[in-house]
C-alpha cells in the first residue's frame, strides 16, 4: 500500500533550490531501485517533478494559491523488470498553503455618493467594499478592516462593514458642496503588517430646504403711465434663495398696502421673478403713488428647519402713476336739442360742455365740425358752448340736423375729442293744406240730387302734435246758386254731391269748383283747390258713354292767409 | 423764471401749530408736484411731503403722518404747510422745492424757496 | 426706508485742490441720485441729477458719478465760492438725503 499524507505547499517559495513537497513511497519498496515511481497528473512533469527512484517530489516553480490553491496529482509505482505496478494508481492532493501576499482590492476605483445636506450624524451615505484574495479560512491575511484616511472629521467609516455615514452636525451644502473621501481597507484585521488598499469616495451634498428667499433690496420703485391697461406689466422684483430646484423656487404675492386691489403679481415660473401687473384702470387724477408689500415665499417647506425662521421675505414696492395728457371730456356721449322752424337767427338751442380730465384741468374752447354743417346753419359760442342759429330753418326741408361739436384743450391743441349733436326742428304750422291730387269728375246728364260724385282729400306739409284737422267748403263766391254742395265728412275728407235733378251737356259741359280746405291749427292755414266736373251721356247703368273733348284746365289753388 | 417765496419767520409755543406758505411764479402752478422739505439748525435735509396742487393729492413722509398737512390755493399758486403738535425738536429751517417732474411723483427738486425759520420755544 | 450716507461729514482743502465726494446707499438706487450745495442761511441748489447729468448754469467743473449704491461727486479745481456743505438725494424711491459733507478752506 502506499504510505503518504495529504501533501502541503507553501505558496510564493523564493528559494534558489527547488521547493520540496514530499515522498511518494510503497510499503513493497526494499530500497533496491527495483521500483520507479510515475507522477502524473496537474503540473507533473513540468511544476512538479518526482525522482523516480526515490518517490521525492519538487515544485520547479513558484506557486500561487490565489491562482491555483489545490493540484490532483496520480502516483504510480511500477517493478522495473517487469513492467507491472506493484500498488494501484492513486490520486492525492497537493494543497497550497496560503501566505498573506494580496491587499485588499475596492470593487470600485472611485465611488459616488450623495447624502442630503444637514442630515443627523450616523446618517448612512454609501456602503464600500474591500475583497483580500487571500483565504479567508486560515489565518487574518483575508480579514480586511475600514479606516478613513480623508475626510475627517465630515465622515466615519464602520470598519468592519465599510458603511461610510455622516460625522458632523449641520453639514450646509450652501457652504461646502462637494467632499473628497479616502477609506482604506487593511487585511491581517487592521494590525501591523497587514497590507492595504484604498478608494476614492465623492460625496456631494444634497439640497433641502434650509434658506429662505431673501430681497436684495427692501425697497423697488417702479413708473407706469396711466392710460397702462389692464395686465400691463411695469416692473420685476426678484429674491434669490441659496438653495437649489425645487427648494429654489419662489412664489409672489402682494400682501398689504394701498395698492392691493390695483395690481398683481405673477411669478415667471422660468426666471423666478415677481411681475408686477396693472390689475384695474389707474387714474393720475385719482392717485399718484401707490406702495405695496410683496412677498416672496417658497412653496414647499420642510417643518423641520422651520425653526430658522420663516421661509418667506418681504419687499416694499412703490409705484409711481404718470400723468398721461387725455383729451377733454364732454358731459353727455351725445346731446340731443330742439328747436321752431321758425326760430330767428342767432337764437340759442341749448349748450354743450366738456372738461379736461387731467389734474391741471386745462381750458377748453369749442367748435363745430364744418364737415358735418356744410351750409353753416349752427354756430357754437367758443368760450362756453353755447349753440345758436346762423340761418333760418325749414322743418319741412330737413326735420334733424345731426352736427359734430369739437372741444379742444387750448394749451394743447393736439388733445381733442368730439360729441355728435341731434338737432331736432319743431314743427310750426306754415303751410296750407291742399287736395292731395288734382280732382277731375264727371256727373252724367241724369243725374238725382244728392248723389256723391267725389270723394276730396287734402295733405298738409305741416305736422301738428295733434293731427290734421281739415275743413273743406265751396268758396264763398261759388257758394250762391251753385249746382253742387259741398259735405264736410269731418275726417279730413269732404264729398262732392249734385244738388239738382239733371244736367245738360249742350248748356254747360264743364263746371269749376272752387273748394276751400283750412287746417285747424295756429295761425290758421287754408288754400283753394278747383274741381273740374264734366257733364256727360250715360247708360241707364250710370255708365258714362261721351263727354265734349273740350281742352281740361288745371287750376291752380289759391292760398289765403298764408 | 420760476421763483418760490415763503412767509416770514415764526417763533411758537410746544403745542401749538404752524403755517408756513410758498408762493409760486414763473410757470404753471397745477402742473408740478410741490415739496417740503425741513433742516434742523446744523443738521441735514429731511422729506416731509408733497401735493399736487392740479387735484389737492398729497403724500407725506411716514414720520409726520398724522401731523403735517400740505395744502394748495390755486387761485394764488400758493402752497401751504401746517405742522401740529409741535415740540422743541420741530425748530427748523422749512423749505419748500418744486419737483422737476410734472407728470410723475418722482425725481429732484430743482427750484427750492428761500427757506422759513420756524422757532419752538416755550 | 433707503438710508443715504455721506463721507466724509467734513473735509479741509485748498483752491485748486481736487475734492472727491462720495454716497453710498443702503440698496440699489440705479442712477437716480441728485447732489446739491448749500451755503450757509441759503436753500440747497441744484448740481447734479441722474447721478452724472450737469443741471444747467452749474460750472463744468462739478462732476458726478456712479450708479447702483456707490456714488461720487467731484469737484476738479475748487474754487473760493464752492466751500459750502453738499448734499446727495435719493429719489428712487421716496426721498431720502445723506448728512452732508461741509467743505471748509484749509
Known amino acids: 500500500s502506499w504510505m503518504w499524507n495529504q501533501f502541503f505547499l507553501l505558496e510564493e517559495y523564493t528559494g534558489s533550490d527547488y521547493q520540496y513537497v514530499g515522498k511518494l513511497h510503497s510499503d513493497q519498496d526494499r530500497g533496491d531501485g527495483s521500483l520507479k515511481y510515475i507522477l502524473s497528473g496537474d503540473g507533473a512533469g513540468d511544476l512538479f517533478i518526482i525522482n523516480e527512484n526515490t518517490g521525492d517530489i519538487q515544485a520547479t516553480k513558484r506557486l500561487d494559491r490565489e491562482e491555483k490553491p489545490v493540484y490532483i496529482l496520480r502516483a504510480q509505482a511500477i517493478n522495473r523488470r517487469t513492467g507491472r505496478p506493484v500498488e494501484p494508481e492513486s490520486e492525492f492532493i497537493i494543497k497550497i498553503h496560503d501566505i498573506n501576499d494580496n491587499e485588499p482590492i475596492f470593487t470600485k476605483e472611485v465611488y459616488t455618493a450623495t447624502v442630503p445636506e444637514m442630515s443627523d450624524v450616523g446618517t448612512f451615505v454609501v456602503q464600500v467594499t474591500a475583497t483580500d484574495a487571500d483565504d479567508p479560512t486560515y489565518g487574518n491575511s483575508a480579514k480586511v478592516v475600514y479606516s478613513i484616511l480623508q475626510g475627517q472629521p465630515y465622515f466615519s467609516v464602520e470598519s468592519e462593514t465599510g458603511i461610510i455615514k455622516t460625522a458632523l452636525l449641520n453639514m450646509d451644502r450652501e457652504n461646502r458642496e462637494q467632499y473628497q473621501v479616502v477609506i482604506q481597507a487593511k487585511d491581517m484585521g487592521g494590525q501591523m503588517g497587514g497590507l492595504s488598499g484604498t478608494t476614492t469616495v465623492n460625496i456631494t451634498l444634497t439640497d433641502v430646504n434650509d434658506n429662505p428667499p431673501r430681497f436684495p433690496q427692501s425697497t423697488y420703485q417702479f413708473k407706469t403711465p396711466e392710460s397702462s391697461p389692464p395686465g400691463t406689466p411695469i416692473g420685476r422684483i426678484k429674491a434669490s434663495d441659496a438653495d437649489v430646484g425645487e427648494n429654489a423656487e419662489i412664489e409672489y404675492s402682494i400682501t398689504d398696502g394701498e395698492g392691493l386691489d390695483m395690481f398683481d403679481v405673477i411669478t415667471d415660473q422660468e426666471t423666478q421673478e415677481g411681475i408686477i401687473t396693472v390689475k384695474k384702470l389707474l387714474d393720475f387724477e385719482k392717485k399718484k403713488v401707490y406702495t405695496l408689500k410683496v412677498e416672496a415665499s417658497n412653496p414647499y417647506v420642510e417643518p423641520r428647519f422651520l425653526y430658522l425662521g420663516p421661509f418667506k421675505d418681504s419687499a416694499t414696492v412703490r409705484i409711481v402713476v404718470e400723468d398721461v395728457d387725455e383729451p377733454p371730456v364732454f358731459s353727455k356721449l351725445a346731446y340731443i336739442l330742439q328747436i321752431r322752424e321758425d326760430a330767428q337767427i342767432n337764437t340759442t338751442i341749448g349748450s354743450v360742455t366738456a372738461q379736461d380730465p387731467d389734474a391741471a384741468r386745462n381750458p377748453v374752447k369749442y367748435s363745430v365740425d364744418r364737415h358735418t354743417d356744410m351750409d353753416r346753419i349752427f354756430n357754437i359760442d367758443s368760450g362756453n358752448g353755447s349753440i345758436f342759429t346762423s340761418k333760418l330753418l325749414d322743418r319741412e326741408t330737413l326735420l334733424w340736423h345731426n352736427i359734430t361739436v369739437i372741444a379742444t384743450e387750448i394749451n394743447n391743441p393736439k388733445q381733442s375729442s368730439r360729441v355728435p349733436l341731434y338737432i331736432k326742428v319743431l314743427d310750426v304750422n306754415d303751410n296750407a293744406p291742399e287736395f292731395a291730387e288734382f280732382y277731375e269728375t264727371f256727373v252724367c246728364e241724369k243725374a238725382k240730387a244728392d248723389q256723391l260724385i267725389q270723394t276730396l282729400h287734402a295733405v298738409d306739409k305741416d305736422d301738428p302734435y295733434s293731427g290734421h284737422q281739415f275743413s273743406f267748403s265751396l268758396a264763398p263766391e261759388a257758394a250762391s246758386g251753385s249746382n253742387f254742395t259741398i259735405q264736410d265728412n269731418k275726417d279730413n275728407t269732404a264729398g262732392i254731391l249734385t244738388r239738382k235733378n239733371g244736367y245738360n251737356r249742350h248748356e254747360m259741359s264743364t263746371y269749376l269748383l272752387p273748394v276751400v280746405i283750412s287746417d285747424n291749427d295756429y295761425p290758421v292755414q287754408s288754400s283753394t283747390g278747383t274741381v273740374t266736373v264734366r257733364v256727360c251721356a250715360c247708360d241707364h247703368h250710370g255708365n258714362m258713354q261721351s263727354c265734349h273733348a273740350e281742352a281740361l284746365i288745371h287750376p291752380t289753388g289759391l292760398s289765403t292767409g298764408a | 423764471e420760476v421763483q418760490l417765496v415763503q412767509s416770514g419767520a415764526e417763533v411758537k409755543k410746544p403745542g401749538a401749530s404752524v403755517k408756513v406758505s410758498c408762493k409760486a411764479s414763473?410757470?404753471?402752478?397745477?402742473?408740478?408736484?410741490m415739496h417740503w422739505v425741513r433742516q434742523a439748525p446744523g443738521q441735514g435735509l429731511e422729506w416731509m411731503g408733497w401735493?399736487?396742487?392740479?387735484?389737492?393729492?398729497?403724500e407725506y413722509a411716514s414720520k409726520f403722518q398724522g401731523r403735517v398737512t400740505i395744502t394748495a390755493d390755486t387761485s394764488t399758486s400758493t402752497a401751504y404747510m401746517e405742522l401740529s403738535s409741535l415740540r422743541s425738536e420741530d425748530t427748523a429751517v422749512y423749505y419748500c422745492?418744486?419737483?422737476?417732474?410734472?407728470?410723475?411723483?418722482?425725481?429732484?427738486?430743482?427750484?427750492w424757496g428761500q427757506g422759513t425759520l420756524v422757532t419752538v420755544s416755550s | 426706508d433707503i438710508q443715504m450716507t455721506q463721507s466724509p461729514s467734513s473735509l479741509s482743502a485748498s483752491v485748486g485742490d481736487r475734492v472727491t465726494i462720495t454716497c453710498k446707499a443702503s440698496?440699489?438706487?440705479?442712477?437716480?441720485l441728485a447732489w446739491y450745495q448749500q451755503k450757509p442761511g441759503k436753500a440747497p441748489k441744484l448740481l447734479i441729477y441722474?447721478?452724472?447729468t450737469l443741471q444747467t448754469g452749474v460750472p463744468s467743473r462739478f462732476s458726478g458719478s456712479g450708479s447702483g449704491s456707490d456714488f461720487t461727486l467731484t469737484i476738479s479745481s475748487l474754487q473760493p465760492e464752492d466751500f459750502a456743505t453738499y448734499f446727495c438725494?435719493?429719489?428712487?424711491?421716496?426721498?431720502?438725503f445723506g448728512q452732508g459733507t461741509k467743505v471748509e478752506i484749509k
Open positions: 422745492a418744486r419737483g422737476v417732474y410734472g407728470g410723475a411723483a418722482g425725481g429732484y427738486f430743482d427750484f
Open positions: 414763473g410757470y404753471t402752478f397745477t402742473r408740478n408736484f
Open positions: 401735493i399736487y396742487p392740479g387735484d389737492g393729492e398729497t
Open positions: 440698496q440699489n438706487i440705479y442712477k437716480n
Open positions: 441722474d447721478a452724472n
Open positions: 438725494q435719493q429719489y428712487y424711491s421716496g426721498w431720502a
